[in-house]
Interface confidence: low
C-alpha cells in the first residue's frame, strides 16, 4: 500500500496547504491559497493530461508519423493520448509503437500459422507431409497436395513441402 500523505486523495501539499489537483483534461494555472481554490484550465487542441494533476503544461498528443509507417488508431482527447498503430503490412518495433517494421514473410516450405497484426509479427509453421507452399508470403497457408486419384490420375512426381504433386494419366495396357 502507498504510504499515507498529509492530504486527501486528489489533493497535493503546497506551502503547508492542501490544494485540489486539476482533473484529467485540465492543467494547473495557480495553486490554491488559504482563501482561493486551485485554478485549472482545459488543455488546448492536440493536448491532453490523463491523470488528476498539478501540471502547468498539458502533454502534446503523440504524432503518428507516416514516414515511420504509423497511422492513428485512436484519436487523442483532452484526457487521452493518441494511440498509434502500424500501416497494413507492418508492426510495431517497441512498446510505445514509436516506429514500424515490415511483417515477416513465410518462405517456401512454410505457411502462415498466424497472420501478423499491428503489434505482432507473422507466425510461420513448416508445411507438414501432405501440404506445400511454393511462395514467400505473409498471408498464404500451406496448401494440401493435389489428390490425383479424385481426378482419375496417378502421381507422376511426389510432392514436397515446397512443391505440389505432379499428376499424370494412368498407363493403360493395350489388348
Amino acid at each position: 500500500p502507498e504510504p499515507p500523505t498529509a492530504c486527501r486523495e486528489k489533493q497535493y501539499l503546497i506551502n503547508s496547504q492542501c490544494c485540489s489537483l486539476c482533473q484529467p483534461g485540465q492543467k494547473l494555472v495557480s495553486d490554491c491559497t488559504e482563501f482561493t481554490e486551485t485554478e485549472c484550465l482545459p488543455c488546448g487542441e492536440s493536448e491532453f493530461l490523463d491523470t488528476w494533476n498539478r501540471e502547468t503544461h498539458c502533454h502534446q498528443h503523440k504524432y503518428c508519423d507516416p514516414n515511420l509507417g504509423l497511422r492513428v488508431q485512436q484519436k487523442g482527447t483532452s484526457e487521452t493520448d493518441t494511440i498509434c498503430t502500424c500501416e497494413e503490412g507492418w508492426h510495431c518495433t517497441s512498446e510505445a509503437c514509436e516506429s514500424c517494421v515490415l511483417h515477416r514473410s513465410c518462405s517456401p516450405g512454410f505457411g502462415v500459422k498466424q497472420i501478423a497484426t499491428g503489434v505482432s509479427d507473422t507466425i510461420c509453421e513448416p508445411c507438414p507431409v501432405g501440404f506445400f507452399s511454393n511462395v514467400s508470403s505473409a498471408f498464404e497457408k500451406c496448401h494440401p497436395w493435389t489428390s490425383c486419384e479424385t481426378k482419375d490420375l496417378v502421381v507422376q512426381q511426389a510432392g514436397t513441402n515446397k512443391t505440389d504433386v505432379v499428376c499424370g494419366p494412368q498407363d493403360r495396357l493395350r489388348a
Partner: antibody, heavy 114, light 106 residues
Framework: QVQLVQSGAEVKKPGSSVKVSCKAS????????MHWVRQAPGQGLEWIGY????????KYNQKFKDKATITADESTNTAYMELSSLRSEDTAVYYC???????WGQGTLVTVSS | EIVLTQSPATLSLSPGERATLSCSAS?????MHWYQQKPGQAPRLLIY???KLASGIPARFSGSGSGTDFTLTISSLEPEDFAVYYC?????????FGGGTKVEIK
C-alpha cells in the same frame, strides 16, 4: 508482486556456451515482452534483444545476433538467453527486464576464463 | 543506431543541491527514459516517456526535453541519490542506453 528471478553466477571456458534463466512471477507472462541487457564490468548498459513469449517472436541487437539466442517457456513462466562461443569479452552481468523496463532481474554474472 | 551521449560524465555535488543531467541523441527520438543504478544492483526505472514519474519514485526527480536534447533533474539531492544515471531510447532499433552520469558526493 512482480518478480524476475535469474539463475546463479556461471564460470565458463572460452568457446563454450551458457544458458541464463529468468523466472517471472506476479503477472501474466505472455502479456509482456522480456528484454535482456548486458553490463560488462565497470561499463554501461547494452540492449541484447527481446522475446514476445506469446508467440516466441524475437528481436535482436545486430551486435548480438550471432551471440545470443532468446527463448521462453510459457509453461514455467521462464525466459532464457543462451550465449554461444564464449570469449573473455562476454564476461558481464546479464539482466532480464520486463517490457517497459519497470522490473528487472537481479542479474547473472557470467565469467569467461580459461 | 542512435547514440546517446550523457553529460557530464561525473557530477560532484552536496546533499541538498540541485542536479541537472543531460542526454543528447544523435537523431531525434520520441521519448527518453531514465534509470538509476547503484553498485551491485540492477537499474531502477525513474522516468519514462520523457517526463512521467515511475511508480514509487519521489517527486524530486523530473524529466524534460524533446527531439535530441533531454534532461533529468533532481531538485534537491538526498544521500540515497548518489548513483549512476542512464538515459535510454526505445524509439529506434537497436534500443540504446547512454554511457551514464555518475553523481558523487562532493
Amino acid at each position: 508482486q512482480v518478480q524476475l528471478v535469474q539463475s546463479g553466477a556461471e564460470v565458463k571456458k572460452p568457446g563454450s556456451s551458457v544458458k541464463v534463466s529468468c523466472k517471472a512471477s506476479g503477472y501474466t507472462f505472455t502479456n509482456y515482452w522480456m528484454h535482456w541487457v548486458r553490463q560488462a564490468p565497470g561499463q554501461g548498459l547494452e540492449w541484447i534483444g527481446y522475446i514476445n513469449p506469446s508467440n516466441d517472436y524475437t528481436k535482436y541487437n545486430q551486435k548480438f545476433k550471432d551471440k545470443a539466442t532468446i527463448t521462453a517457456d510459457e509453461s514455467t513462466n521462464t525466459a532464457y538467453m543462451e550465449l554461444s562461443s564464449l570469449r573473455s569479452e562476454d564476461t558481464a552481468v546479464y539482466y532480464c527486464a520486463r517490457q517497459g523496463f519497470p522490473y528487472w532481474g537481479q542479474g547473472t554474472l557470467v565469467t569467461v576464463s580459461s | 543506431e542512435i547514440v546517446l551521449t550523457q553529460s557530464p560524465a561525473t557530477l560532484s555535488l552536496s546533499p541538498g543541491e540541485r542536479a541537472t543531467l543531460s542526454c543528447s541523441a544523435s537523431s531525434s527520438v520520441s521519448y527518453m527514459h531514465w534509470y538509476q543504478q547503484k553498485p551491485g544492483q540492477a537499474p531502477r526505472l525513474l522516468i519514462y516517456d520523457t517526463s512521467k514519474l515511475a511508480s514509487g519514485i519521489p517527486a524530486r526527480f523530473s524529466g524534460s526535453g524533446s527531439g535530441t536534447d533531454f534532461t533529468l533533474t533532481i531538485s534537491s539531492l538526498e544521500p540515497e541519490d548518489f548513483a549512476v544515471y542512464y538515459c535510454h531510447q526505445l524509439s529506434s532499433d537497436p534500443f540504446t542506453f547512454g554511457g551514464g552520469t555518475k553523481v558523487e558526493i562532493k
